[in-house]
Amino acid sequence: LQDPCSNCPAGTFCDNNRNQICSPCPPNSFSSAGGQRTCDICRQCKGVFRTRKECSSTSNAECDCTPGFHCLGAGCSMCEQDCKQGQELTKKGCKDCCFGTFNDQKRGICRPWTNCSLDGKSVLVNGTKERDVVCGPSPADLSPGASSVTPPAPAREPGHSPQ
């Protein structure tokens, strides 16, 4: 025997208390598939969330974050505060990257500078809070007889000393 509710399209629910007729989803709710017995509640984009896409009877609202925040989690389930480049977000707010680390984005954590010597290379440009070091040719490449290389510019001051 065919389920009479299977005829109810997306945007409706099968209303058993009204002889299984297909009733439209109530305001602020949706059903994205047919045959549903109850419509789902639309997501509300409140506070630091803002509406990227309005809810319709067949699809949920989509949220993003207000300026100064960015999305985290599936479907932007959380908004996290932005920091400046050269900082990371801690429980106490945005903090500068410690010496030897950098962050070139407004989100995420400070990461250690690349260790050029692990690849047998030299430091071409020193790192800062905002930028990783730039590795240059290996010291062997700079030995007499090797093809000429423009000597690196004087190293900039390291970006940040420990506080």
Epitope: N17, P26, Q36, T38, D40
Partner: antibody, heavy 118, light 108 residues
């Protein structure tokens, strides 16, 4: 027979977590939302949230958003609620209840007593 | 959130008499209101939904009325099994769905 069968009473320590279950019989599990409702001793009813077993979509009462996690296991027609960071305020009877149509509750489990005590 | 207020807190009625229970919403909930009965040690049971529609198997002595903010549950002739706590619940618009604090109907 159409019913919701809930897990047995739980005695848990403060700070711990507990996961209680609600097994559906006699109807197609994915057709109906499963809601969870809290009732403190001698108190009224407090709606926690629901899960739609069809698509795992959840909606919460904001005050329980960080307290309760709702999941389902479709093949066994079972819904679960995990409560974390338990305190004495979480000692209560927890009911699962089915929704049909608009969001009233036409079928209830018998309740699971959760007692938080050291 | 919408606050539901029930009155009276306790209603003392003799068997066979009429009982009238009131539920008021802090803002309009249209007709999106349900009534439940709860006996000691038991789960609530749906009596009325959409303000006035009796749920399956509920006797005709139970009736509901009202819309907007003011609602009434009437038990026309109280039977011994009707002595219990009654809750109203709104399910209008946005969650959280909220319940009244309950009215206890006791034997006079």
């Amino acid at each position: 027979q159409v019913q919701l069968q809930q897990s047995e009473a739980e005695l848990v320590r403060p700070g711990a977590s507990v996961k209680i279950s609600c097994k559906a019989f006699g109807y197609t599990f994915t057709n109906h939302h499963i809601n969870w409702v809290k009732q403190r001793p001698g108190q009224g009813l407090d709606w926690i949230g629901y899960i739609n077993p069809y698509n795992d979509y959840t909606t919460f009462n904001r005050k329980f958003k960080d307290k309760a996690t709702l999941t389902v296991h479709k093949s066994s027609s079972t819904a679960y609620m995990e409560l974390s960071g338990l305190t004495s305020d979480d000692s209560a009877v927890y009911y699962c209840a089915r929704t049909w149509g608009h969001w009233y509750f036409d079928l209830w489990g018998r309740g699971t007593v959760v007692t938080v005590s050291s | 959130e919408i606050v539901m207020t029930q009155s009276p807190a306790t209603l003392s009625v003799s068997p066979g008499e009429r009982a009238t229970l009131s539920c008021r919403a802090s803002q309009s909930v249209s007709s999106n209101l349900a009534w439940y009965q709860q006996k000691p040690g038991q789960a609530p049971r749906l009596l009325i939904y959409d303000s006035s529609t009796r749920a399956t198997g509920i006797p005709a002595r139970f009736s509901g009325s009202g819309s907007g903010t003011d609602f009434t549950l009437t038990i026309s002739s109280l039977q011994s099994e009707d002595f219990a706590v009654y809750y109203c619940q709104q399910y209008n618009n946005w969650p959280p769905w909220t319940f009244g604090q309950g009215t206890k109907v006791e034997i006079k």
